[in-house]
């Protein structure tokens, strides 16, 4: 459920309207990513990858369709990636789902999570 703890976590990630975090990624008209992803933080790249996967998995984003897709999105790829994906979804599924349902772009969703500040470490 959208518990008080969730609200605290989400608020902590809210974008400051005056200090929005600029990212290098941009979505093309088909929702494809036009970006030099290696220049972005690992968390942001993870977010973009997962959100793009979810977008491709649903015909029309609704609470139900995105939630159903979210249970399958981390099933493919190497085990290390699956762990990263599951951890990300545990933290952000509600917010990612809400963003997709509202028609936010992958870039907007991931920026709003303040994940576009470069971070170190492998994906």
């Amino acid at each position: 459920r959208l518990s008080p703890e969730y609200y605290d976590l989400a608020r902590a990630h809210l974008r400051d309207e005056e200090k929005s975090c600029p990212c290098l990624a941009q979505e093309g008209p088909q929702g494809d990513l036009l970006t030099k992803t290696q220049e972005l933080g690992a968390d942001y790249r993870t977010c973009l990858t997962i959100v793009q996967k979810l977008k491709k998995m649903v015909d029309k984003p609704t609470q139900r369709s995105v939630s159903n897709a979210a249970t399958r999105v981390c099933r493919t790829g190497r085990s290390a990636w699956r762990d990263v994906c599951r951890n990300f979804m545990r933290a952000y599924q509600s917010r990612v789902t809400q963003g997709l349902v509202a028609g936010e772009t992958a870039q907007q969703i991931c920026e709003d999570l303040r994940l576009c500040i470069p971070s170190t470490g492998p994906l």
């Epitope: 459920r1 959208l2 969730y6 609200y7 989400a10 608020r11 809210l14 309207e17 029309k60 609704t62 609470q63 139900r64 369709s65 939630s67 979210a70 599924q93 509600s94 917010r95 789902t97 809400q98 963003g99 509202a102 028609g103 936010e104 772009t105 907007q108 709003d112």
Partner: antibody, heavy 123, light 111 residues
Framework: EVQLQQSAAELARPGASVKMSCKAS????????MHWVKQRPGQGLEWIGF????????DYNQKFKDRTTLTADKSSSTAYIQLTSLTSEDSAVYYC????????????????WGQGTSVTVSS | DIVLTQSPASLAVSLGQRATISCRAS??????????MHWYQQKPGQPPKLLIY???NLESGVPARFSGSGSRTDFTLTIDPVEADDAATYYC?????????FGGGTKLEIK
């Protein structure tokens, strides 16, 4: 104070078009989707669809898709609905209502509504 | 489309008594632990007003006499005790699936 100010009542001929507006104030326009709801005299509520002012994404109820266009102007914080090829069935009150993109922006439902615009289609 | 059936269509309740309105969905409106069901109050000539969101959360400024409960397909709006100002039509609404849909409404009369 949050306000959604809708345009004045419209009287139109069958086959004509109308464009109604909903000017938002008192909140960050881009953090909310704008929804439109139809209410025929003495009847219940029907959801028409919504627009995300951030991304331009629109989601329509299939029932209204063919003759309805939703737009938004971020610079003036105004949302619009255009109805074409009007018939007597379009005579109704049309409400705009905001809905937060994310649940930490506010109650995750249509929490503020405009006063409604009455449309009368008559020859 | 998810059909929301409200019952009763109308009811008359004495001042100070409890009013209970039911909303049944044709399929579940639950996703990731939330029930995407909301309740609105509408008085003649006015726009709807949000009372309860996500099945059981009281909207800010709404009296605690109003409460919501339920999950999946069965939901209830309770007003206890009823006051004269509560005379209105009440609608449930779901946004778990497109198109978003409303119940047919329940008209509450105060005796």
């Amino acid at each position: 104070e949050v306000q959604l100010q809708q345009s004045a009542a419209e009287l139109a001929r069958p086959g004509a078009s109308v464009k109604m507006s909903c000017k938002a104030s008192g909140y960050t326009f881009s953090r909310y989707t704008m929804h439109w709801v139809k209410q025929r005299p003495g009847q219940g509520l029907e959801w028409i669809g919504f627009i995300n002012p951030n991304s331009g994404y629109t989601d329509y109820n299939q029932k209204f898709k063919d003759r309805t266009t939703l737009t938004a102007d971020k610079s003036s914080s105004t949302a619009y609905i255009q109805l074409t090829s009007l018939t007597s069935e379009d005579s109704a009150v049309y409400y705009c209502a905001r809905h937060p993109i994310y649940s930490d922006y506010g109650p995750y439902a249509m929490d503020y509504w405009g006063q409604g615009t009455s449309v009368t289609v008559s020859s | 489309d998810i059909v929301l059936t409200q019952s009763p269509a109308s009811l008359a309740v004495s001042l100070g008594q409890r009013a209970t309105i039911s909303c049944r969905a044709s399929e579940s409106v639950d996703s990731y632990g939330n029930s995407f069901m909301h309740w609105y109050q509408q008085k003649p000539g006015q726009p709807p007003k949000l009372l309860i969101y996500l099945a059981s959360n009281l909207e800010s400024g709404v009296p605690a006499r109003f409460s919501g409960s339920g999950s999946r397909t069965d939901f209830t709006l309770t007003i206890d005790p009823v006051e004269a100002d509560d005379a209105a039509t009440y609608y449930c609404q779901q946004n778990n699936e497109d198109p978003w849909t409303f119940g047919g409404g329940t008209k509450l009369e105060i005796k």
